[in-house]
Interface confidence: low
């Protein structure tokens, strides 16, 4: 092993403070005790170290904790988190939601990095399921988070967590994901009255089966065309003209503009012409 350079006289760090900004990399390596660094990690984030200096501090922590950092250090990493590799993060055991929030805050305003993805994966696996507080936190930082999960991963989301989901969190979900989420949402909102229920369930309807759409058509919900266009084609096809008319209410006139697009196009082709004519929209089957 290469012999380590000795710390110059009088430069041994007694605490982590702004004076260290002026230390060269080798001086940081020689003069900052890793254990001191670990106990004063909360201060590092307030000191504008250069990226090169942060590399040295990370190296010192890596030497001190070769099996992975303890959570007491992780929660105070601050910008040093940006220096971590997914391999580093896989060694961690993060159990506190506050720790997760602190690290997500560091990456705020940026796309989800491999480091963040690994951190979230470790955290969720450690908890065993995607509980409401975790989901609330993750979707606040990354609105598309839910739709980045596989249907298998989504199956671990308890219905109670669905209350944390906002419409924009589902924007990029595909039908397979909504197939998993819809039954959970239906269960979560089952005790709400008609109009309130529809407001909550609307974003999840891309996973609804025909029978649920038929039930909704009896409740004067006035579904907008944007929601209708996201419904599963196989769920829409069996609906009668009367049921679609009741489902859309005053929005039914929008079918004309969408007559060439799925699922409207396929639905029109399944209907009898004399039934379509009752809508007065000039739809041709």
């Amino acid at each position: 092993e290469v012999e380590k350079t000795a710390c110059p006289s009088g430069k041994k760090a007694r605490e982590i403070d702004e004076s260290l900004i002026f230390y060269k990399k080798w001086e940081l390596e020689a003069c900052v005790d890793a254990a001191l660094l670990a106990t004063q990690m909360d201060r590092v984030n307030a000191i504008p170290f250069t990226y090169e200096q942060l590399d040295v501090l990370k190296h010192k922590l890596d030497e001190l904790y070769p099996q992975g950092y303890p959570e007491s250090v992780i929660q105070h990493l601050g910008y040093l988190f940006l220096k971590m590799s997914p391999e580093d993060i896989r060694k961690w055991n993060v159990t506190s939601l506050e720790t997760l929030k602190a690290l997500l805050e560091v990456n705020k305003g940026h796309e989800m990095s491999p480091q963040v993805a690994t951190l979230i994966d470790r955290f969720v696996k450690g908890r065993g399921q995607l509980d409401k507080d975790t989901l609330d936190t993750l979707t606040a930082f990354y609105p598309g988070y839910l739709c980045s999960l596989s249907p298998e991963e989504l199956s671990s989301v308890p219905p109670s967590s669905i209350w944390a989901v906002r419409p924009q969190d589902l924007d990029t979900c595909d039908p397979r994901q909504l197939d998993v989420l819809y039954p959970k949402a239906r269960l979560a909102f089952q005790n709400m009255n008609g109009s309130e229920y529809f407001v909550k369930i609307q974003s999840f309807l891309g996973g609804a089966p025909t029978e649920d759409l038929k039930a909704l058509s009896q409740q004067n919900v006035s579904m907008d065309l944007a929601t209708f266009m996201k419904l599963r084609t196989d769920a829409v096809l069996p609906l009668t003209v009367a049921e679609v008319q009741k489902l859309l209410g005053p929005h039914v006139e929008g079918l004309k503009a969408e007559e060439r697009h799925r699922p409207v196009r396929d639905w029109i082709l399944r209907q009898r012409q004399d039934d379509l004519d009752t809508l007065g929209l000039g739809l041709q089957g």
Epitope: E15, I16, D17, E18, I21, Q40, R43, A46, P48, T50, Y51, Y79, L82, V106, K108, G109, H110
Partner: antibody, heavy 121, light 112 residues
């Protein structure tokens, strides 16, 4: 000499999105240890800190208003920005950008002249 | 959030008089490790941008007249103008940078 100059629309309608730009000259916004802030001041009222973006790209917002604001930057043009969604009359204010020296002062030593924004239908 | 409270909200003095204004924070702004108070004072003259006067509670910014003095530690801070001049007509704001940033409500200084 360090100079900051804000720009944006003088008048904007309620519910629209507002985008403001701060052009920095004489100093790089990626210089180590410096952060770049947005502050606003409604007519006849005090200063309100909105948020900041630092040299390495980290962004923080005021907890009271963060949900409606987005701060970003263009390092190639040496500019930084703030976007406000769904503006209301309460967003009528003078908007300032400033530079903060985190190493030697922890204070905002350079400010722009401000740009006045009125929200009105 | 750290709340900054300034008093008085306004005061009127004659030129040559000494004036003091107060700024209190809802939590300590003193770092035990750096031994610095993360508090700054700014002056905003009518129609102008704010200007930095004092940082770290008591360090005068370059070019600021020595009649301006900042003092205090922890949660209680004071800005003193030893002999007010006509050009000191302005609103004075304190600001914490201990955790994010917060400005006080300001003290308006008028000259009699």
């Amino acid at each position: 000499e360090v100079q900051l100059e804000e720009s944006g629309p003088a008048v904007i309608k309620p519910s629209q999105s507002l985008s403001l730009t701060c052009i920095v000259s004489g100093f790089s916004i990626t210089s180590s240890s410096y952060c770049w802030h947005w502050i606003r001041q409604p007519p006849g009222k005090g200063l309100e800190w909105m948020g900041r973006i630092c040299y390495e790209g980290s962004i923080y917002y005021s907890p009271s208003i963060k949900s409606r604001f987005t701060i970003s930057r263009d390092t190639s043009l040496n500019k930084f920005f703030i976007q406000l969604s769904s503006v209301t009359n309460e967003d009528t204010a003078m908007y300032y950008c400033s530079r903060e020296n985190r190493l030697l002062k922890d204070a905002m030593d350079y400010w722009g002249q401000g740009t006045s924004v009125t929200v009105s239908s | 959030d750290i709340v900054m409270t300034q008093s008085p909200s306004s005061l009127a003095v004659s030129a040559g008089e000494k004036v003091t204004m107060s700024c209190k924070s809802s939590q300590s702004l003193l770092s035990s490790r750096t031994r610095k108070n993360y508090l700054a004072w700014y002056q905003q003259k009518p129609g102008q941008s704010p200007k930095l006067l004092i940082y770290w509670a008591s360090t005068r910014e370059s070019g600021v007249p020595d009649r301006f003095t900042g003092s205090g530690s922890g949660t209680d801070f004071t800005l003193t103008i030893s002999s007010v001049q006509a050009e000191d007509l302005a609103v004075y704001y304190c600001k914490q940078s201990y955790n994010l940033r917060t400005f006080g409500g300001g003290t308006k200084l008028e000259i009699k």
